[in-house]
């Protein structure tokens, strides 16, 4: 006869491991007992369990409640055992020794491999601002056994670097994603992808990029200067900019206070029926936590009864 077993049994942490040991005997042969032991190199054999044809199952106190025979029906030539709720410390070499009559004793070894799936974590880097050089956007760490694979999935252009730390029974892998921040990256997903043989599918953690920026400011509303004449109603100036975080707007008049009746509504400056008092230099001040910008325009309210030429100055400053 001969013993049938596996060279390697692989199980995920917390699952049950079946340690196979089947005696393929000739007709009339009987298995009297099967002794299981742990036989890691450098240490003496540690008895695990004894399956006796007459006395039944005996389990070492160290494995009490964790070693069982497979559920019935059982073949009397099957010396396999179940190791419940596998932990990392169970990883190692095991030996089954089968005592038979009349053929004698047989033994076989197998290696139990316990996969420890990673629990990845993603840590965003420092605040991203347009104009910075190469900056850490995020780092992703995953620890498991064997070492997990950590990659990135994103449309954003960047560079990655990885490092690994080996522990006694596992390895931690950290991958960093660096980029040169630009406003086009705002709201873009950056996904850490962790692969491991103990996972049914890749684990993904997504971080949404936030890049602080403030665009140049400009003022709209003076495109047709002929519309800015005495008595006109509904005249308005609108300040144009964009930013992250969203900017706030403030209107001032360079050559004095804002005339009475002029309404400030965020990025818009609304005028009452125009008079010559409304002529002047208006400044739109745009700001967010990242930066500030100014844009100024000159309003010249025309008197239709005057034949004087008209001139418009648009100045943008930051």
């Amino acid at each position: 006869g001969e013993l049938e077993t596996s060279d390697v049994v692989t199980v995920v942490l917390g699952q049950d491991a079946k340690l196979p040991c089947f005696y393929r005997g000739d007709s009339g042969e009987q298995v009297g007992q099967v002794a299981w032991a742990r036989v890691d190199a450098g240490e003496g054999a540690q008895e695990l369990a004894l399956l006796h044809s007459k006395y039944g199952l005996h389990v070492s106190p160290a494995y009490e409640g964790r070693v069982e025979q497979p559920p019935p029906p059982r073949n009397p030539l099957d010396g396999s055992v179940l190791l419940r709720n596998a932990v990392q410390a169970d990883e190692g070499e095991y030996e089954c020794r089968v005592s038979t009559f009349p053929a004698g004793s047989f033994q076989a070894r197998l290696r139990l491999r316990v996969l420890v799936p990673p629990l990845p974590s993603l840590n965003p880097g420092p605040a991203l601002e347009e104009g910075q050089g190469l900056t850490l956007a995020a780092s992703c760490t995953a620890e498991g056994s064997p070492a997990p694979s950590v990659t990135w999935d994103t449309e954003v252009k960047g560079t990655t670097s990885s490092r690994s730390f080996k522990h006694s029974r596992s390895a931690a892998v950290t991958s960093e994603f660096h980029l040169v921040p630009s406003r086009s990256m705002n709201g873009q997903p950056l996904t850490c992808v962790v692969s491991h043989p103990g996972l049914l599918q890749d684990q993904r953690i997504t971080h949404i990029l936030h890049v602080s920026f403030l665009a140049e400011a400009s003022v709209r509303g003076l495109e047709d200067q002929n519309l800015w004449h005495i008595g006109r109603e509904g005249a308005m100036l609108k300040c144009l900019s964009e930013g992250q975080p969203p900017p706030s707007y403030n209107w001032t008049r360079l050559d004095g206070p804002l005339p009475s009746g002029v309404r400030v509504d965020g990025d818009t400056l609304g005028f009452p029926p125009l008079t010559t008092e409304h002529s002047g230099i208006y400044v739109c001040h745009v700001s967010n936590e990242f930066s500030s910008r100014d844009s100024q325009v000159t309003v010249d309210v025309l008197d239709p009864q005057e034949d004087s030429g008209k001139q418009v100055d648009l100045v943008s400053a930051s």
């Epitope: 008895e47 004894l50 044809s53 005996h58 070492s60 005592s99 038979t100 009559f101 009349p102």
Partner: nanobody, 122 residues
Framework: EVQLLESGGGLVQPGGSLRLSCAAS????????MGWYRQAPGKERELVSS????????SYADSVKGRFTISRDNSKNTLYLQMNSLKPEDTAVYYC???????????????WGQGTQVTVSS
């Protein structure tokens, strides 16, 4: 020739203790699991406890768990059963048993001692 000789039985009051011994000869003692069985009048023989060849692995019937302790001294070729908190229902003839599954045809087999009587009564 394989021989098993039990001793240590007797009359004891409920709650008392006894220690049974089984002297073995005629085989490589430390190589084989051994067991204690008992048989009460009019009942079938039942396995009380068993122990691996090294003595590190043990098993007990639910009815004696926590009260009986099996052990063996391989240097003296002797098997023991320490019985505490004895009850009237423990009354039976106790047998020492060895089942030798491997070897030549002269030793392979299932061997029993002649038994020792344990009576628990007030």
């Amino acid at each position: 020739e394989v021989q098993l000789l039990e001793s240590g039985g007797g009359l004891v009051q409920p709650g008392g203790s006894l220690r049974l011994s089984c002297a073995a000869s005629g085989f490589t003692y430390s190589g084989y699991a051994m067991g204690w069985y008992r048989q009460a009048p009019g009942k079938e023989r039942e396995l009380v406890s068993s122990i691996s060849g090294s003595g590190t692995l043990t098993s007990y019937a639910d009815s004696v768990k926590g009260r009986f302790t099996i052990s063996r001294d391989n240097s003296k070729n002797t098997l023991y059963l320490q019985m505490n908190s004895l009850k009237p229902e423990d009354t039976a003839v106790y047998y020492c048993d060895v089942d030798i599954p491997v070897g030549d045809a002269t030793t392979v087999g299932d061997y029993w001692g002649q038994g020792t009587q344990v009576t628990v009564s007030s």
